[in-house]
Interface confidence: low
């Protein structure tokens, strides 16, 4: 027989199948040109000394063979003696060490058996009613196909599924979607209505994330507020990476989970923009304001659950950076200015009313005045900070007020509003005898003492009504008692107390008269 023809004789070996687990398998035959055909197969087991024979039986019952030696691929033409227009049955017999191993048979019409391609190019993945939908363009001249898929997770082996018949320029498949694990999919195709024809190769992996992106397990820390009024937000713990199936490890697109940082500045609500979204790698600097920080995880199906943290305001206060002057026309604040053309946000809130909205004002961009100060003024009629109570004032600055991450804290301090001089006057001044020449003076704490850093000191004044001599005694702001000594018995004294701030002398309390009784000895 000629090597290019199928030989209609008995093959040169004994026809006994060894029943071995090794041997030829996965035979596929198809047309590769108008008159050319190809069959190929796999051989499992040791290949030394193995000879392969492609067997073919026609519908008439006549059978022939091609001897291919050690090759597992054979090309032949429609002139090789094999009927290409009628159904034929093909299989491989591999002969080695005096025994024969047979492949499973395939029955097909060779002329109609076109080598089908797997889905190529871009496979679009979307979610449809809790299932996964894959869609791709049908390879050229291959409309009409059966499609199968196989899928696996990081912990499972391949499972086979059926996409059903396809008969259009685009093909699609509905597949199961896992809630919490990533999956790898592959697809293959074969000609529709030709059960004996061979399947295409499997497509490249399609990597699909779980329906729910994983909850981002991250932790933040915030550095101390620097001298520039900013503090760095740092990531203490990176998000855990998703476990991936074998074919999706490496730079496989599709399963990526992206994490974004959403920053919401709670202080200064009158500024232009309160929220900003950044990539998680780009950790920002923050002002000393309070923030909510959310980490949003998202994959190709959209955003998943997010985690939110509250970053409290930096409570460190500057004792004297803010100067407030109250005049007849109104009130002006002065503070050390930042660079040229800086916008300031001034926010204040009565102490103890932290749950309520702070009053917030945005200045026009302003340059430092000749003394290097920035200012903000308001009229008396506005009633702002007019009540006699303690206010917490924070001033923020930015040269780019619409950029949330470029705000910084200028100062944070306390101020007693209204007529602090009168409101701060100590009440309930009482005098008790202490010894033969001394008394103890007590008073109730000034309202100013509720305002951290505002009360500089108490001053106790004692006047001798006989001689009109006056002595003044400074007292620490934390004390509400002082002992007056070297007093004379029988002399009338008056005592008064006042509370002073750094920039304001308080009003004296009502005079309290007392005297030390003369001790009469028996």
């Amino acid at each position: 027989c000629r090597t290019s023809e199928c030989c209609f004789q008995d093959p040169p070996y004994s026809d006994a199948d060894s029943g071995s687990a090794s041997g030829p398998r996965d035979l596929s035959c198809y047309r590769i040109s108008s008159a050319g055909y190809e069959c190929s197969w796999q051989y499992e087991g040791p290949t030394a000394g193995v000879s392969h024979f492609l067997r073919c039986c026609l519908s008439s019952g006549r059978c022939c063979y091609f001897a291919t030696g050690s090759a597992t691929r054979l090309q032949f033409s429609d002139q090789a003696g094999v009927s290409v227009l009628h159904t034929v049955t093909l299989w491989v017999e591999s002969w080695a060490r005096n025994r024969t191993e047979k492949s499973p048979e395939v029955t097909l019409q060779l002329y109609k058996s076109v080598k089908y391609k797997p889905p190529l190019g871009d496979i679009k993945v979307s979610k449809l009613a809790g299932q996964l939908r894959m869609e791709w363009e049908t390879p050229d001249n291959q409309v009409g196909a059966e499609v199968q898929f196989r899928h696996r997770t990081p912990s499972s082996s391949w499972k086979l599924g059926d996409c059903g018949p396809q008969d259009d320029d685009t093909e699609s498949c509905l597949c199961p979607l896992e809630m919490n694990v990533a999956q790898e999919f592959q697809l293959r195709r074969r000609r529709l209505g030709s059960q004996g024809s061979s399947w295409s190769k499997w497509s490249s992996p399609v990597c699909v994330p779980p329906e729910n992106p994983p909850q981002p397990q991250v932790r933040f820390s915030v550095e101390q507020l620097g001298r520039d009024g900013r503090r760095r937000l740092t990531l203490k713990e990176q998000p855990t990476q998703l476990e991936l199936p074998e074919g999706c490890q490496g730079p496989a697109p599709g399963v990526e989970v992206t994490y974004q940082l959403q920053l919401h500045m709670l202080s200064c609500p009158c500024k232009a923009k309160a929220t900003r979204t950044l990539p998680l790698e780009k950790m920002p600097y923050l002002s000393g304001a309070a923030y909510n920080v959310a980490v949003i995880s998202s994959n190709r199906f959209g955003p998943g659950p997010n985690q939110t943290w509250h970053i409290p305001a930096d409570t460190h206060t500057e004792p004297v950076a803010l100067n407030i002057s109250v005049g007849t026309n109104g009130t002006t604040m002065y503070w050390p200015a930042r660079a040229q053309s800086t916008t300031y946000c001034i926010e204040w809130q009565p102490v103890g009313q932290e749950g309520s909205l702070a009053t917030c004002n945005l200045t026009a961009p302003q340059d430092p005045d000749p003394a290097g100060m920035a200012t903000y003024s308001w009229s008396r009629e506005s009633g702002a900070m007019g009540q006699e109570k303690c206010y917490h004032i924070t001033i923020f600055a930015s040269a780019h007020p619409k950029k949330l991450t470029l705000w910084s804290t200028v100062l944070s301090t306390y101020h007693f509003g209204g007529n602090a001089s009168a409101a701060g006057t100590p009440h309930h001044v009482s005098v008790k005898n202490h010894s033969l020449d001394s008394v103890s003076v007590d008073w109730a704490p000034s309202l100013l003492s509720t305002c951290p850093g505002v009360l500089k000191e108490y001053v106790v004044r004692c006047r001798d009504e006989d001689s009109n001599q006056v002595s003044e005694h400074p007292v620490q702001p934390t004390e509400t008692q002082v002992t007056l000594s070297d007093l004379r018995a029988g002399v009338a004294y008056t005592v008064q107390v006042r509370a002073d701030t750094a920039w304001l002398r308080g009003a004296w309390s009502q005079p309290q008269r007392f005297s030390i009784k003369v001790q009469v000895s028996d």
Epitope: A272, C360, L362, A364, W378
Partner: nanobody
Amino acid sequence: QVQLQESGGALVQPGGSLRLSCVVSGFTSDYFAIGWFRQAPGKEREGVSCIGSSDGSTIYSDSVKGRFTISRDNAKNTVYLQMNSLKPEDTGVYYCALDRGRRTIIGYACYATMKYWGKGTPVTVSS
């Protein structure tokens, strides 16, 4: 509903003056910011000047500081823009806009995100 009606736009020579008026109706809040914006042909809309409702605090863009003055007459629900020493670059459609006081007692906010807008009045400065 809230309505703003501008008037006073005209053709004027460089160095001349104009006074724009904006009448507000249908707005009842005590606290609001109101202002003037302009849009030159082929350019973005920009803030010119704004005024706060309660304390009368004002804000001006650098390009008009010292030449334009914003004022208001609460009784007439009207805001004015007095424009002096006009220049060709002041040409454009001038819009009046209003927004409520953004959680602020005595503040103002002069942004293109104002909630209510008038239809505009054209100002042309040309010789």
